[in-house]
């Protein structure tokens, strides 16, 4: 083993290095001292370090470590943050288009329904947005709400235009009849299935991306323990105390220290791997009715078909509803 | 037969959006994201090594510091922790993760469970017998996964989706991100971190 180079007789070099860390020289001894009060950089002989310097080194070592960790995760963090923003905005755009398509369908095919239909369609797609962003809305309730609201307007405007406006009593009766008589056939159920499946997947996809950001942020801002700070100090700075300014830590030694400091963080590894693989599986399955883009942009067509279905059965329906809601209608016509 | 939202169709049976065809769809963007994420699959296990490679470590020097003394780079003492009496490295590992790390692990377990639940086989998506009682409904054909319309005439097979990402106000390509490669070790760059903190080579 080669003999260590003789320590700087005056600690001059150590002082000039330490000055960068801590302006003001009072902590650095003029000449090497026994260093019996040192707790981390235990000297084998005279040392140019004091207890105060040691504390400053520990602080700096932990700061170094935090910066290294942040720079290590920068690219990953950027990747997830940017994609979460892109997808959130893209999903909002999909919802906006879907709403516009549906409104256009009403305007082109059923102009007499438009003012109210626009309102109900708007509320439905607002609910869709809220759901995607994590609000606790039941998709079946959203779809029922849309059809419950639409049917009275369809009945009074398309099927039975003689009814007076603001027929509140009949509207309530019609809302009830809508479900009891299944006036839209199975279209509401079809829409519920498609919308709930596609939105669930979309929502979990966004949730997963946001959790990814949270994971990186958590590990990015970890505060390292005192023990870790001591190990890092010993590795990066204790050589200075002996005047060995240009010496670097041994590679294997660095790995051992890092494994120790990061033992907790590395425990995330198993779950992180699983997270990426599970997310891949989810993404691979996001097609057809599991793809909100596909489902929402086709909704106008399904809603149109559901109204056609009502019109096709108008004769049968009008008779049944005439009997069912007779009481309400009499009150209206009086 | 119905009017459809004007400027949206070339062919009534296929939803073709009259936007400029961009190469990127949401699904291609999703797949691209997954591919990039997969390059980070070992991120946490590789972290100790990554940090060592990005901090000053003896690479070409004959001598290196082992925490106590100057040793030859390939000697046994180089890898040994030169501070065994001060506190036990094993003890440090035994302490277990910080509470915040435990919390985030719990959240990861939860989302992984949800992701797995959502990623079940996709074959049997819609009930084939959607039409129960009530006024009869049009049939959707065999592949109800794709049945976006409902009754024969108005049924539309939704072909390729809108190319939305063109509309996004910004194009966030991760290739332009700072510090692009996880594997690369730009030795000159990381020195500045240490210079700022007073560490000099």
């Amino acid at each position: 083993q080669p003999p260590p180079p003789p320590p700087d007789a005056t600690c001059h070099q150590v002082r000039s290095f330490f000055q960068r860390l801590q302006p003001g020289l009072k902590w650095v001894p003029e000449t090497p001292v026994p260093g019996s009060d040192l707790q981390v950089c235990l000297p084998k002989g005279p040392t140019c370090c004091s207890r105060k310097m040691e504390e400053k080194y520990q602080l700096t070592a932990r700061l170094n470590m935090e910066q290294l960790l942040q720079s290590a995760s920068m690219e990953l963090k950027f990747l997830i943050i940017q994609n979460a923003a892109v997808f959130q905005e893209a999903f909002e755009i999909v919802v906006r288009h879907a709403k516009n398509y549906t409104n256009a369908m009403f305007k082109n095919n059923y102009p007499s329904l438009t003012p109210q239909a626009f309102e109900f369609v708007g509320e439905f797609f607002t609910d869709v947005s809220l759901y995607i962003l994590g609000s606790d809305i039941n998709v079946d309730d959203m779809v029922n709400e849309l059809f419950d609201s639409l049917f009275p307007v369809i009945y009074t405007q398309l099927m039975n235009p003689g009814l007076p406006d603001s027929a509140l009593d009949i509207n309530e009766c019609l809302r009830g009849a809508r479900r009891d008589l299944k006036v839209f056939g199975n279209f509401p159920k079809l829409i519920m299935t498609q919308v709930s499946k596609s939105l669930q997947v979309t929502r979990i996809f966004l949730q997963a991306l946001n959790l990814g950001i949270e994971v990186i942020n958590t590990t990015d801002h970890l505060k390292f323990s005192k023990d870790c700070g001591r190990m890092l100090t010993r590795m990066w700075y204790c050589s200075y105390c002996q005047g060995l300014m240009m010496v670097k830590p041994c590679g294997g030694y660095c790995n051992v220290v890092m494994q120790g400091c990061m033992a907790g963080v590395v425990e995330i590894d198993k779950y992180w791997r699983e997270y990426i693989l599970s997310l891949e599986e989810l993404v691979n399955g996001m097609y057809r009715i599991y793809d909100m883009e596909n489902v929402l942009l086709g909704l106008f067509s399904t809603i149109h078909d559901s109204i056609q279905y009502v019109q096709k059965n108008a004769g049968k329906l009008t008779t049944t509803i005439g009997k069912l809601c007779a009481h309400s209608q009499q009150r209206q016509y009086r | 037969s119905a009017y459809y939202p004007e400027d949206l169709f070339i062919d009534k049976k296929v939803l073709k959006v009259a936007h400029v065809e961009h190469e990127e769809t949401l699904s291609s963007r999703r797949r691209e994201l997954i591919q990039k994420l997969k390059s980070f699959i070992s991120f946490y296990s590789a972290l100790p090594g990554y940090i060592c490679s990005h901090s000053p470590v003896a690479e070409n020097d004959t001598l290196c510091w082992n925490g106590q003394e100057l040793v030859e780079r390939y000697s046994q003492k180089a890898a040994r922790n030169g501070m065994k009496n001060q506190f036990n490295l094993h003890e440090l590992k035994m302490k277990g993760p910080e509470p915040v790390v435990s919390q985030i692990i719990d959240k990861l377990k939860h989302i992984n469970q949800l992701l797995r639940t959502m990623s079940m086989p996709k074959g049997r998506v819609l009930d084939k017998n959607l039409d129960e009682e009530g006024f009869e409904s049009g049939d959707c054909g065999d592949d109800e996964d794709e049945c976006i319309g409902g009754s024969g005439d108005g049924m539309i097979k939704v072909k390729n989706q809108l190319r939305f990402l063109a509309e996004l106000a910004y194009d966030l390509d991760v290739d332009d991100a700072p510090g692009n490669s996880q594997q690369a070790t730009p030795k000159d760059n990381e020195i500045s971190t240490f210079h700022n903190l007073g560490n000099v080579h």
């Epitope: 607002t126 609910d127 809220l130 609000s135 039941n138 079946d140 309730d141 029922n144 709400e145 419950d148 | -």
Partner: antibody, heavy 121, light 111 residues
């Protein structure tokens, strides 16, 4: 005639339980979200809880979360509020209110007359 | 969840106008969520006056009007009448779909 009628209020000791009911008539009950709103003597309105049309989603104010449970029986056109671990600060007139919409809170277009709950030892 | 902010009182003479403000945050009123207004007489149940920021249910006089901008909403009563003396509450909801009320404004018709 659209109507809501609350019942079940009264004097109760702190820590005890009470169940409020609200009978609905004159509208398609199963088609609308429903709410409980309370008003302490001389104070403003405070929203307590909501339930969507199917009962599939429920919402609570922070002040009652974990202690109160909202539920509905669409076949009986009735809304319920189960109040456990009652505190003095729960003393108020409790109103049952119908929402304009079915999926979640929006605006309350029909209100009951209220039932007084007094929590005191 | 925090309440919306309303002035505690407002007053005006018959025939005059009164405006009541209601200030929320970016997570309720400012988050595209609509505002509703209620009128309440002492000892009575509240009554819906305005919903979706500006719409009036049938039966509500057009002297009452609502508006919304950013995180604030307001209720205007023009041509004030004696029977308009009451408490007025604004209401919205947040992204958790929990309802928030304002603290209430007591309107006094002078003279």
């Amino acid at each position: 005639q659209v109507q809501l009628q609350e019942s079940g209020g009264g004097l109760v000791q702190p820590g005890r339980s009470l169940r409020l009911s609200c009978a609905a008539s004159g509208f398609t009950f199963s088609s609308y979200a429903m709410h409980w709103v309370r008003q302490a003597p001389g104070k403003g309105l405070e929203w307590v809880s909501a339930i969507s049309s199917s009962g599939g989603s429920t919402y609570y104010a922070d002040s009652v979360k974990g202690r109160f449970t909202i539920s509905r029986d669409n076949s009986k056109n009735t809304l319920y509020l189960q109040m456990n671990s009652l505190r003095a600060e729960d003393t108020a007139v409790y109103y049952c209110a119908k929402d304009r919409r079915g999926s979640h809170a929006d605006a309350f277009d029909v209100w009951g007359q209220g039932t007084l709950v007094t929590v005191s030892s | 969840q925090s309440a919306l902010t309303q002035p505690p009182s407002a007053s005006g003479s018959p025939g005059q106008s009164v405006t009541i403000s209601c200030t929320g945050t970016s997570s309720d009123v400012g988050h595209k969520f609509p505002v509703s207004w209620y009128q309440q007489y002492p000892g009575k149940a509240p009554k819906l006056l305005i919903y979706k920021n500006l719409l009036r249910p049938s039966g509500v006089p057009d002297r009452f009007s609502g508006s919304k901008s950013g995180t604030s909403a307001s209720l205007a009563i023009t041509g004030l009448q004696a029977e308009d003396g009451a408490d007025y509450y604004c209401q919205s909801y947040d992204s958790s779909l929990r309802v928030v009320f304002g603290g209430g404004t007591k309107v006094t018709v002078l003279g």
